[in-house]
């Protein structure tokens, strides 16, 4: 017998053909041989079946002989083998319903697991095979878990269902709630104004939460809150900023902050934390700022940086157009009496300049 | 370690006055937000009033407004509940509080001072 | 006023046992809910910021849940020295109000 696989909500049709291509007596029935529908004279009529009012025929097609039956809104429970009766044979096609859903909302948090859960009809063994839109591959049986959603799982999940070597495809959409980038840092020079920038991941059409940035500045001893915010239908309020430093913040997505200026004082990093409604649990992203400072004093030229960096980042003193240059994988590089002229200091990553900041020598006589 | 000590409170006639003092150390009491919070004997906790870091912005629950005020000097580390016109009512627990949590927590709070008001 | 209403006032429950405390806002307060746990004599100690998060130290049987009007303390395994008296407090708007505590006693 012919083998149908079908999704739950869909509409499968299940054929049955003639050998003489013209219209004829047919009838479809279930296995309990309850007549579902049939032909009487040129009308379609239904039988006492629960699939009656679900249930169809392609009348156009009668007079070619193709006795099709069309169920629509497929329940799990449509499962069963339908036979056709036609030409006094009868063919049977066994109709096997899955359904495929997640156990919870699909928007959901980075860090959030993810469960699909498969409905089958009794008796059937289907194997799931599921393809994240980042080209992950997930196995299972009845169900399909993700433990940690991370914000490439965004997207269209295509999961195949497979039974009897026939196969069906569900495509579920999972939105992964989070900021695009999970961590950013911003290099700036000494009294430069600072923007940060926390752009999202996902669009929702209302958007309402609540939000702080707690900041941990390298030279202070305990971290504390810069800025907390509300978040209503995509408009930011500002609830209660500290005083130093006197943070602005945009009153529309993506969620935008400015810092007046780059002080050694407020180097450090941040985390930014936003609560949604109808959530369970936060998003974050972390922030870092690394400030820099070139000062001359006395017979002294010093270049500093502030904040986090990596002990691969190198840090440099060179005077243009000169060969003369300073470098060390430290926070602070210092020249002893240095020539008149421009020097650059400079914070560079494998030859890349992070940041840079200029200072004049002036000759002393 | 956060300290925060309370003290002035006492026995005081209805129509009194009383001033309490709060204390504070091993902090940066300049940056942040203080509040006075108050328990009446075997009741709930009532938040009083808060003051931000300069003093320049000041709330206080409708019970208190206009008989209490809420002040602080940073050079000293300390922080004020000037408490005018008292009725039995706000006999209480008054307990000095930083806000410091995340989210505008009330993180460390003092041990607590009795204001009993009573003739 | 944002008028905060704790159930229930209290609870009788054993050493092991899931407790859960609920919190209504008379309005929406998003994430702005913390909650403390005071025990008698002493001062309360915060626990829960933004409605679900664990303050450092807090142990990790404790969990908040909730945004808006609608908020939930649980103590998944009940321990001797959680015997004490929770409250919730709004932090979205002055005055700052808080529930009238729920007592977790011994039974």
């Known amino acids: 017998k012919k083998v149908v696989l079908g999704k739950k909500g869909d509409t499968v049709e299940l054929t049955c053909n003639a050998s003489q291509k013209k219209n004829t007596q047919f009838h479809w029935k279930n296995s309990n041989q309850i007549k579902i529908l049939g032909i009487q004279g040129l009308f379609l009529t239904k039988g006492p079946s629960k699939l009656s009012d679900r249930a169809d025929s392609r009348k156009s097609l009668w007079d070619q002989g193709c006795f099709s039956m069309i169920i629509k809104n497929l329940k799990i429970e449509d499962s069963d083998t339908y036979i056709c009766e036609v030409e006094n044979k009868k063919e049977e096609v066994e109709l096997l319903v899955f359904g495929l859903t997640a156990n919870s909302d699909t928007h959901l948090l980075e860090g959030q697991s993810l469960t699909l859960t498969l409905e089958s009809p009794p008796g059937s063994s289907p194997s799931v095979k599921c393809r994240s839109p980042g080209g992950k591959n997930i196995q299972g049986g009845r169900t399909i878990s993700v433990p940690q959603l991370e914000r490439q799982d965004s997207g269209t999940w295509t999961c195949t269902v497979s039974q009897d070597q026939k196969t069906v495809e569900f495509k579920i959409d999972i939105v992964v709630l989070a900021f695009q980038k999970a961590s950013s840092t911003v290099y700036k020079k000494e009294g430069e104004q600072v923007e940060f920038s926390f752009p999202l991941a996902f669009t929702l059409e209302k958007l309402t939460g609540s939000g702080e940035l707690w900041w941990q500045a390298e030279r202070a001893s305990s971290s504390k809150s810069w800025i907390t915010f509300d978040l209503k239908n995509k408009e930011v309020s500002v609830k209660r900023v500290t005083q130093d430093p006197k943070l602005q913040m945009g009153k529309k997505l993506p969620l935008h902050l400015t810092l007046p200026q780059a002080l050694p004082q407020y180097a450090g990093s941040g985390n930014l934390t936003l609560a949604l409604e109808a959530k369970t649990g936060k998003l974050h992203q972390e922030v870092n700022l690394v400030v820099m400072r070139a000062t001359q004093f006395q017979e002294n030229l010093t270049c500093e940086v502030w904040g986090p960096t990596s002990p691969k980042l190198t840090l440099s003193l060179k005077l243009e157009n000169k060969g003369a240059t300073v470098s060390k994988q430290a926070k602070a590089v210092w020249v002893l009496n240095p020539e008149a002229g421009m020097w650059q200091c400079l914070l560079s990553d494998s030859g890349q300049v992070l940041l840079e900041s200029n200072i004049k020598v002036v000759p002393t006589w | 370690e956060v300290q925060l000590v309370e003290s002035g409170g006492g026995l005081v006639q209805p129509g009194g006055s009383l001033r309490l003092s709060c204390a504070a150390s091993?902090?940066?009491?300049?940056?942040?937000?203080m509040s006075w919070v108050r328990q009446a004997p075997g009741k709930g906790l009532e938040w009083v009033a808060n003051?931000?870091?300069?003093?320049?912005?000041?709330y206080y629950v409708d019970s208190v407004k206009g008989r209490f005020t809420i002040s602080r000097d940073n050079a000293k580390n300390s922080l004020y509940l000037q408490m005018n016109s008292l009725r039995a009512e706000d006999t209480a627990v008054y307990y000095c509080?930083?806000?410091?949590?995340?989210?505008?927590?009330?993180?460390?709070w003092g041990q607590g001072t009795l204001v009993t008001v009573s003739s | 006023d944002i008028q905060m209403t704790q159930s229930p006032s209290s609870v009788s429950a054993s050493v092991g046992d899931r407790v859960t405390i609920t919190c209504r806002a008379s309005?929406?307060?998003?994430?702005?809910l913390t909650w403390y746990q005071q025990k008698p004599g002493k001062a309360p100690k915060f626990l829960i910021y933004?409605?679900?998060s664990l303050q450092s130290g807090v142990p990790s049987r404790f969990s908040g849940s909730g945004f808006g009007t609608d908020f939930t303390l649980t103590i998944s395994s009940l321990q001797p020295e959680d015997f004490a008296t929770y409250y919730c407090?709004?932090?979205?708007?002055?005055?700052?109000?808080f529930g009238q505590g729920t007592k977790v006693e011994i039974k």
């Open positions: 509080v930083r806000e410091g949590g995340q989210w505008l927590a009330l993180d460390y």
């Open positions: 003051i931000n870091q300069d003093g320049g912005e000041k």
């Open positions: 309005q929406g307060i998003s994430s702005w």
């Open positions: 091993g902090f940066t009491f300049s940056s942040y937000w």
């Open positions: 407090q709004q932090a979205n708007s002055f005055p700052w109000t």
């Open positions: 933004a409605a679900s």
